[in-house]
């Protein structure tokens, strides 16, 4: 009867340049070991090579020379005694593309190349991008650990080198930005900026990168109220501090715009004399329209900002002057009030 040599291995495998792949494999061979037990040696060879002369791509035989170009990158994984011939290929290179065959040797009786079951390896261009991991959301002033990793990469071959770039990193020293991990303390101005992690394999021309846009949460800042007068001159006042008095002529029309810088956007609401104004008068953007102001419609106006990271408010006093003539009179600003605008 014919000796039984069998090999289970996939016909083809594809891996991206610079990445790793594990090719599962098992084999069987005829063995009757009642008299001696010589060592079992297994080999992976490039197709078309004569096993007696060729350098191997991977083996468990310490006396056989391994091809320098596959040394350390092609490795037998698993226990060959348990007939496991699985092959790990790391830091794949374009020139690794091709067919490979497996061979078993044990003493003088077992010597066999499994030429019928070749493994076809295809190495394609690297399109895999690194992953950037961090806990979202980023919060202004709170140190956050970011990590960069390349899926499908492994320990085999030269190490990966990392480099981080982005406006948010400007204060960091260059050494910090060459690690796969970095700690970033984001600022409000970093929101919306790009952060890039570039991964390169040392000694190779294989580079890949991923860019993320930073989403930095920060408390409301730069709260301001702008008052637009409907007098045809397009004049605007900007209120930045509480308690300012703004005199205005009766019958005037105003737009009050409350602006604030925050992320996520804060919710804005208007109050007059402590009472919330009718939503129909206000817009989502925090604009309040006061058409044709009457003598009794002045008082303290407050823009209130609500936000998960803190609330703020800004108030001013609208002082309505009765109309005495049709001329535009501008009086000098006194004790924290603005000139009278008509």
């Amino acid at each position: 009867e014919k000796p039984v040599y069998e090999l289970q291995v996939q016909k083809s495998v594809t891996v991206q340049e610079g990445l790793c792949v594990l090719v599962p494999c098992s084999f069987s061979y005829p063995w009757r070991s009642w008299y001696s037990s010589p060592p079992l040696y297994v080999y992976w060879f490039r197709d078309g090579e004569i096993p007696y002369y060729a350098e191997v791509v991977a083996t468990n035989n310490p006396d056989r020379r391994v091809k320098p170009e596959t040394q350390g990158r092609f490795r037998l994984l698993g226990d060959v005694q348990k007939k496991n011939c699985s092959l790990s290929i790391g830091d794949a290179r374009m020139e690794d593309t091709g067919s490979y065959f497996f061979r078993v040797e044990r003493g003088r009786d077992v010597k066999y190349s499994y030429q019928q079951n070749k493994l076809n390896l295809e190495v394609t261009a690297l399109i895999e991008k690194p992953d950037i991991h961090f806990l979202e959301p980023l919060e202004s002033g709170r140190p956050t650990r970011l990590s960069c990793s390349l899926p499908g990469s492994c320990e085999a071959g030269p190490p990966l080198t990392f480099s981080w770039t982005g406006n948010a990193l400007s204060p960091l020293d260059p050494e910090t930005t060459r690690s796969s991990e970095l700690t970033l303390t984001p600022r409000p101005e970093d929101h919306g900026t790009n952060l890039t992690c570039q991964v390169k394999r040392q000694g190779a021309q294989v580079t890949t990168e991923r860019t993320v846009q930073l989403n930095v949460s920060y408390a409301p800042q730069n709260l301001a109220i702008s008052i637009f007068f409907r007098n045809g001159t397009g004049t605007a006042l900007r209120i930045l501090s509480n308690g300012m008095s703004v005199p205005i002529q009766e019958g005037q029309s105003l737009f009050l715009a409350c602006t604030v810088d925050s992320n996520p956007p804060a919710s804005l609401s208007w109050f007059r004399e402590g009472k919330a104004l009718n939503p129909s008068q206000t817009s989502m953007s925090g604009t309040l329209e006061l058409p044709n102001i009457g003598a009794r419609e002045g008082g303290e106006f407050t823009c209130r900002v609500q936000h998960p990271l803190g609330s703020q408010h800004l108030s001013f006093i609208l002082s309505v002057q009765r109309s005495s003539s049709s001329c535009i009179c501008v009086t000098e600003k006194q004790q924290g009030s603005w000139p009278l605008l008509t």
Partner: antibody
Amino acid sequence: QVQLQQSGGGLVKPGTSVKLSCKASGYIFTEYIIHWVKQRSGQGLEWIGWFYPGIISIKYNEKFKDKATLTADKSSSTVYMELSRLTSEDSAVYFCAGHEGYDGAMDYWGQGTSVTVSS
Amino acid sequence: LMTQTPLSLPVSLGDQASISCRCSQSIVHSNGNTYLEWYLQKPGQSPKLLIYRVSNRFSGVPDRFSGSGSGTDFTLKISRVEAEDLGVYYCFQGSHVPWTFGGGTKLEIK
């Protein structure tokens, strides 16, 4: 037990061809490299070439490239050497020898077959 | 080119015999091995392998046979010649195509 059984040869006319056989047994045919070696009467040994059935690899000594053609039939585990355009210089004993393993030696030999070229 | 010396070596039984083989170039194969072999051919027989890879005895070969050398110079030694050792000894290199045999050394009784 590995055996290489040779046949063919004998007395042949100049200008003709002869096909020598080397039938292998006792091992897996694809696992051995089969070499052919020439020995003229009272002379030394000359390597002609090899045939490796494992990957159908054939190597020739440049001197015999136009003289010898190596082929094989896997189904009968036989390697053939055809010698063409025979002259008296081709009169010799031809051996086939098998080698396998990393040691690289011709560890099994056929009994040899004699070719005499004469009109 | 493989140059074997001497061409003929007359010995007495029990003597030591030494045969030299010089190669015209290094016969270290690209895989790191040196495929230098020694064969013995007795009259009317096929050659038989004695030594492979410079110094390794083939199975069944008596330990009175030993091989040594490196690069281009190699030696076969027979420590105590016996009657069954008589014949023609050939060195052979299987590192570079064309593979080549030495010219042979005839070991004979003095």
